[in-house]
Structure formats: structure tokens, C-alpha cells
């Protein structure tokens, strides 16, 4: 769930998610609408799609707690949990490394971005 995601993002990016990413742009944080503002925002939009897919599969994305290992900069999702737990971990791992890959284009002005300014077509999944 959310606790897993926060911890994973902090470990991978080195940034405190609550200060740096939740919210950020038009898709990082709860909800999301409009065209993503930059590559970091695209990471979150893709992550939203990943979660949406798991919701259609009956997974409790905010409640399910999974185990994972973080060592030498890599995330290893445990194969011990249920299908939902493993897939949820995979979604979170993907967004964490996506955010890390795009740290160089991170824009402080997009933190706490005013959502009514999020216009344009919301990308489909």
C-alpha cells in the first residue's frame, strides 16, 4: 500500500515523497487529470494506470502490504506474497525507478501544482 510506496520511493530516489512528489504536477499524488507536465509526471500517470489495472483485477491497492528487499540500489519484490501483492510491488518498483531516472529534469515549480491548471486530454492507459 501507500506505506510501501513511500518507503520505496525514498530509498530509490533519496527524496522524501511527501515533500517532493505527493503532490507533483498533474498526476503525482492522489487522483490525476490532464496532460502530464513532464517526465516525472508521466511516471506517476503510468503508475496510476498500473494501479487501475490491479483494481480491475480485484486487488486492494491501498490496503495490500507487500514485502520487498532493497539492497545495492535495487528492489527485489518478494515472491512469497499473493499475486496482488507481487503485482503491486512491481507497479511501485517501476514508478520508483522511473522517478529516479528523471531526477535531472525534476522541477520544483511543479511541486504542489494547482490542479485546475491541469488541462488537455488525460492520457489513456
Amino acid at each position: 500500500g501507500i506505506l510501501n510506496l513511500n518507503k520505496m520511493v525514498k530509498q530509490v530516489t533519496g527524496k522524501m515523497p511527501i515533500l517532493s512528489y505527493w503532490p507533483y504536477g498533474c498526476h503525482c499524488g492522489l487522483g490525476g487529470r490532464g496532460q502530464p507536465k513532464d517526465a516525472t509526471d508521466w511516471c506517476c500517470q503510468t503508475h496510476d494506470c498500473c494501479y487501475d489495472h490491479l483494481k480491475t483485477q480485484g486487488c486492494s491497492i491501498y490496503k495490500d502490504y507487500y514485502r520487498y528487499n532493497f539492497s545495492q540500489g535495487n528492489i527485489h519484490c518478494s515472491d512469497k506474497g499473493s499475486w496482488c501483492e507481487q503485482q503491486l510491488c512491481a507497479c511501485d518498483k517501476e514508478v520508483a525507478f522511473c522517478l529516479k531516472r528523471n531526477l535531472d529534469t525534476y522541477q520544483k515549480r511543479l511541486r504542489f501544482y494547482w490542479r485546475p491548471h491541469c488541462r488537455g486530454q488525460t492520457p489513456g492507459c
Epitope: 480491475t56 480485484g58 486492494s60 495490500d64 515472491d79 512469497k80 506474497g81 499473493s82 499475486w83
Partner: antibody, heavy 120, light 106 residues
Framework: QVTLKESGPGILQSSQTLSLTCSFS??????????VAWIRRPSGKGLEWLAH???????RYNPSLKSRLTISKDTSRNQVFLKITSVDTADTATYYC????????????WGTGTTVTVSS | QIVLTQSPAIMSASPGEKVTISCSAS?????MYWYQQKPGSSPKPWIY???NLASGVPARFSGSGSGTSYSLTISSMEAEDAATYYC?????????FGAGTKLELK
Amino acid sequence: QVTLKESGPGILQSSQTLSLTCSFSGFSLSTSGMGVAWIRRPSGKGLEWLAHIYWDDDKRYNPSLKSRLTISKDTSRNQVFLKITSVDTADTATYYCARRGPGTWYFDVWGTGTTVTVSS
Amino acid sequence: QIVLTQSPAIMSASPGEKVTISCSASSSVSYMYWYQQKPGSSPKPWIYRTSNLASGVPARFSGSGSGTSYSLTISSMEAEDAATYYCQQYHSSPLTFGAGTKLELK
């Protein structure tokens, strides 16, 4: 050849603690990905998963029974243990231990089972 | 938790007859697993990941399904197939089993 064998008290009184032992051979619980579970079948009912323990000592419990269950292992002696506190007649069942193969979501080898009767 | 409902609870089939045992999940699952249990014996893995036969399972058995509806089929019933069959999921925690279908020889 992989084998598992359960042992227990046979009969015990209501409110007592049930202690079960699973002795296994043919595999090691120190192998990455390996796990052993306890499953029971009350007389005339279906199977119920109770708990799991893994090579790294990670433990999982059935939420409906979690407060009463404790699973543990002795890797060097190839044994897994289950304790159920405050038993009552509803805990009368055949108890099985089973191996969960690495990376699978099912049990590939089961023990023969041990019958436990709780008397009031 | 996901509840697995097996139907029928008890059934009988004649040798050579086609048999279908159903397992319905209370919400969608990714895979279903099946076990066979005979009186006095422990359960044996029978079908894994919905449609794959476990080692030593005769080819007359098959598994299928998706979402909330899964089934185990015997193309031609034989005496040795008389047993109780259980379905199991671990799509989401906790891991759950169906109550079982007892298949008898007519």
C-alpha cells in the same frame, strides 16, 4: 524424495494450547524461496490455510486466527512448529503441513496429516 | 477474503462419463489451483495455474477458466478418479480453498 510428517497430541482439552510438529526431509528450509505451511480440514468440512513460514523466517497467518497462532522453525532439525492457543471443539480437525515450492502459489507436497480432537 | 464456492458439493458419475466440477470466486482471481484427495490420504496437487496438470495426472483431466469462473473437467470418468477435489486461490491474501466437491463412482 520429499516427505513431510505431522505429529501432535491426538486429544486435548478445551482452552489448552495445541502444539504441532512437522518433520520433513528431502529439502531444506534454508533454500531461498522455500516455505512450509499448516493447513487443516475439520471433519466434514473443507481445507483451511492457517500459516506459512519461509526460509528467511518470514511468517504469514490467516487473519481470522492470527491472534491464536504461532509458527516457528528449526532449520537444522528440518522441523516446523505450530502452536494454537485457547483451543475449542471447532479446532477438531486433521492438520497437515505442506511444502510451498519456490515461486509458486500452491502446495506441491503434503504430509499424511495428524488428527486432533478437542474435547469440552 | 476471496470465497471459493464449489459446485456441486457431491456428484456421482459412471465410467466413461464426462465430469465438470466448478469453482466460483467471490471476486476475480488470476489463477486457480486444484487438489485431489482420497479417503485416508493427504491432498495431492492436481492442476496448477488454472490449466497445467501436475506430474503424474492423467491427460483426461483438464482445467480452464478466468475471472471468477473456473472448472476442472474429466473427459472420461474412471474408477480411480473418485475422490474429493478442492480449488485454491492465492490471488489475494489470505490464501483460501473451496469446500470441496466429492466425486463418487456410479
